[in-house]
């Protein structure tokens, strides 16, 4: 089941999925001046069996001015730095995503890919939030959001994160230890049962990740 909305946006924060649940789709978008090859896929799809998940289809872009198809290459470091994604492209993978059953890793970049990745998430997907560079967490409760099914409708739980400019905060008595909770909203506040995610095993690890994994500013 696809999630109806995008994950919540938080002022001066970005979000990232550490892995993508089977059923997730990633649009094959090309940067300006390029287009999908004629017979090319519209999207990549995370699929798999009980032991292994991977992305089906390959995205390929070609110059709008020529008919030549492009080969799949990894961008040079300068190009990589330019790329922004909806969930913040990360220079390293802090979690061993291959060991997470039913999930795919971040897909590798393709040549002349658009600067922003558009994902279509499925129920059970979890994303993690971090303040952007120049901001820090004034308050951090459970700083993740999960797409859940409630009353036949999908919704994202609310991440509890407030970011403030580093010079704005009156007092920082001690560094916060991020809390890891699978719920964006306490169960006592929901009026019926909701589906849970099998992605919660990552919460503890991802909630304590170094901020260095979140390098791309995206608002």
């Amino acid at each position: 089941e696809l999630c109806d909305d995008d994950p919540p946006e938080i002022p001066h924060a970005t979000f990232k999925a550490m892995a993508y649940k089977e059923g997730t789709m990633l649009n094959c978008e090309c940067k300006r001046g390029f287009r999908r090859i004629k017979s090319g896929s519209l999207y990549m799809l995370c699929t798999g069996n009980s032991s292994h998940s991977s992305w089906d289809n390959q995205c390929q872009c070609t110059s709008s001015a020529t008919r030549n198809t492009t080969k799949q290459v990894t961008p040079q470091p300068e190009e990589q730095k330019e790329r922004k994604t909806t969930e913040m492209q990360s220079p390293m993978q802090p979690v061993d995503q291959a060991s997470l059953p039913g999930h795919c890793r971040e897909p590798p970049p393709w040549e002349n890919e658009a600067t922003e990745r558009i994902y279509h998430f499925v129920v059970g997907q979890m994303v993690y939030y971090q303040c952007v560079q120049g901001y820090r967490a004034l308050h951090r409760g459970p700083a993740e959001s999960v797409c859940k099914m409630t009353h036949g409708k999908t919704r994202w739980t609310q991440p509890q994160l407030i970011c403030t400019g580093e010079m704005e905060t009156s007092q920082f008595p001690g560094e916060e230890k991020p809390q890891a909770s699978p719920e964006g909203r306490p169960e006592s506040e929901t009026s019926c049962l909701v589906t849970t995610t099998d992605f919660q095993i990552q919460t503890e690890m991802a909630a304590t990740m170094e901020t260095s994994i979140f390098t791309t500013e995206y608002q």
């Epitope: 002022p11 409760g141 609310q158 991440p159 509890q160 007092q171 916060e176 809390q179 909770s181």
Partner: antibody, heavy 118, light 107 residues
């Protein structure tokens, strides 16, 4: 049921200090930050500051020029707002309000009237 | 600080009327704007957040729109119980700042 219950009305003399409490219940108190908002009689709303109920981090509105101090007692799920050097223009209703995810103030306290009079 | 200029400061309208209240921020607040309704002697109640997201339980006659610096609250068909004062709030930057309020009266 989520509730924010504030302490009762106060009458203070100019120059005094007032401390108002706001007790949260029905939810995990330390997951949600707490804000304080002032409303003078017949006037609009003024944001005073916010505290992280988890870490104690605060951010204040400089309009209150260091007269406001927000604290938290996690053991009793209570936030406090202290306003010092009171003057007559501090006569107002003071609200605590919980911050919920990507929007502030999903639940409010009932308000506490503070009257400053000589 | 970001200034929020709300207009009109008061208005009178009839039941069934379409009512609009506007808020202008002194800088781009990237849609981090909420609308509140406050009735006399009561705490404010959130109607809209993120400029256009309706809070659960709020009647669908209320809607929000706008981006950048300019935002609007619309009541599509005014009801007697909508008599109240309405405030906007920006929460893009600290300190959070409210509009001056719009007092809505029923003719």
């Amino acid at each position: 049921e989520v509730q924010l219950v504030q302490s009762g009305a106060e009458v203070k003399k100019p120059g005094a200090t007032v401390k108002i409490s706001c007790k949260g219940s029905g939810y995990t108190f330390t997951d949600y930050a707490m804000h304080w908002v002032q409303q003078a009689p017949g006037k609009g709303l003024e944001w005073m500051g916010v505290i992280s109920t988890y870490s104690g981090n605060t951010n204040y509105n400089q309009k209150f020029k260091g007269r406001v101090t927000i604290t938290v007692d996690k053991s009793t799920s209570t936030a406090y707002m202290e306003l010092s050097s009171l003057r007559s223009e501090d006569t107002a209703v003071y609200y605590c309000a919980r911050s919920y995810g990507n929007y502030p103030f999903d639940y409010w306290g009932q308000g506490t009237l503070v009257t400053v009079s000589s | 600080d970001i200034q929020m200029t709300q207009s009109p400061s008061s208005l009178s309208a009839s039941v069934g009327d379409r009512v609009t209240i506007t808020c202008k921020a002194s800088q781009d607040i990237t849609s981090y704007l909420s609308w509140f309704q406050q009735k006399p002697g009561k705490a404010p109640k959130t109607l809209i957040y993120r400029a256009n997201r309706l809070v659960d339980g709020v009647p669908s006659r209320f809607s929000g729109s706008g981006s950048g610096q300019d935002y609007t609250l619309t009541i599509s068909s005014l009801q007697p119980e909508d008599m109240a004062t309405y405030y906007c709030l920006q929460y893009d930057e600290f300190p959070y700042t409210f509009g001056q309020g719009t007092k809505l009266e029923i003719k």
